[in-house]
Amino acid sequence: VKMAETCPIFYDVFFAVANGNELLLDLSLTKVNATEPERTAMKKIQDCYVENGLISRVLDGLVMTTISSSKDCMGEAVQNTVEDLKLNTLGR
Amino acid sequence: EICPAVKRDVDLFLTGTPDEYVEQVAQYKALPVVLENARILKNCVDAKMTEEDKENALSVLDKIYTSPLC
């Protein structure tokens, strides 16, 4: 998905939270130098996904995927690509 | 840069009321099962997280959005 390319660390953290994998979340949060209180807060969100089971995680993942691939986001991604191309062309 | 619609979704998940969050989810996926799940998750997060927890989660988001990996 084009949007995942635009902010990979966001999707890393989101899917680590929604997946319920604490180790994966810790690894993702290390990439952004999260403090201990920040990790604790993110784990509380993760707990909600874990407590509500697999179906809940799948459904919320579906929502995020739908938003990320919606015209609201894809239009944004196309616009960003056009801007990048313009800058690259001007930079030559 | 993160898509504004995604940012809005995440912001509402953390700082909006359950009705506001579910309303926004409905704009993209209006299935009853999806909306019910969104409300359950939102209510859970609101029950678990203190004011300080939410400040810390928002701080993580700031770090994500300003990261070279974003």
Epitope: - | P4, K7, R8, D11, L12, L14, T15, G16, T17, P18, D19, E20, E23, Q24, D46, M49, T50, E51, K54, E55, L58, S59, D62
Partner: antibody, heavy 119, light 107 residues
Framework: EVQLVESGGGLVKPGGSLRLSCAAS????????INWVRQAPGKGLEWVSL????????YYADSVKGRFTVSRDNAKNSLYLQMNSLRAEDTAVYYC????????????WGQGTTVTVSS | DIQVTQSPSPLSASVGDRVTITCRAS??????LAWYQQKPGRVPQLLIY???TLQSGVPSRFSGSGSGTDFTLTISSLQPEDVATYYC?????????FGQGTKLEIK
């Protein structure tokens, strides 16, 4: 100390414009949703607008939609209310108020700034 | 939009009286209701949120109850310093409508 201070009120003619400011201190401003609430002389409280911490979502009361614009500058810890096409019924004390993250209520209010719309 | 109606207004009571103010929403709002107190010439102050939770620093003579559409603010023993206008507000979603206010006076 958590504080909000409004400024920018004054006398303006009907159809005119005014920009109100709200300066915040004592808390991490960028994290908090902020409301504008107004109170006409001798009347009750009326909610006007809310802007989220990152400006990703904004809500307005129907009575001001299309005429008022709320914005914020997190680097300056400041909130703004641009009021255009002002009417006599917009005459009020305007308050900015912080919305809590946990319970979504207005826990901190500014002292208010008075806007008078009159010819 | 959901309407919020407060009653009675105004309200006159004696010191030591038990005072009750009611607030009704035109549709269910769960417990997303707050009560604010505004003393004459002062800024509004949060009293109660989530229908029944007392804000820190608020005297225990104040209490709130209700859920759905019908809510109540009670002052168990009215004090002279409670002279103020009381507003309920629904905050489940925008617009965050206030009730019209109940002006409380001492007899």
């Amino acid at each position: 100390e958590v504080q909000l201070v409004e400024s920018g009120g004054g006398l303006v003619k009907p159809g005119g414009s005014l920009r109100l400011s709200c300066a915040a201190s004592g808390f991490t401003f960028r994290n908090y949703n902020i409301n504008w609430v107004r109170q006409a002389p001798g009347k009750g409280l009326e909610w006007v607008s809310l802007i989220s911490g990152s400006s990703s979502y904004i809500y307005y009361a129907d009575s001001v939609k299309g005429r008022f614009t709320v914005s914020r500058d997190n680097a300056k810890n400041s909130l703004y209310l641009q009021m255009n096409s002002l009417r006599a019924e917009d005459t009020a004390v305007y308050y900015c108020a912080r919305r809590t993250l946990s319970y979504y209520v207005m826990d901190v209010w500014g002292q208010g700034t008075t806007v008078t719309v009159s010819s | 939009d959901i309407q919020v109606t407060q009653s009675p207004s105004p309200l006159s009571a004696s010191v030591g009286d038990r005072v009750t103010i009611t607030c009704r929403a035109s549709q269910g709002i769960s417990n997303y209701l707050a009560w604010y107190q505004q003393k004459p010439g002062r800024v509004p102050q949060l009293l109660i949120y989530a229908a029944s939770t007392l804000q820190s620093g608020v005297p225990s003579r104040f209490s709130g109850s209700g859920s759905g559409t019908d809510f109540t603010l009670t002052i168990s023993s009215l004090q002279p310093e409670d002279v103020a206008t009381y507003y309920c507000q629904k905050y489940n979603s925008a617009p965050y409508t206030f009730g019209q206010g109940t002006k409380l006076e001492i007899k």
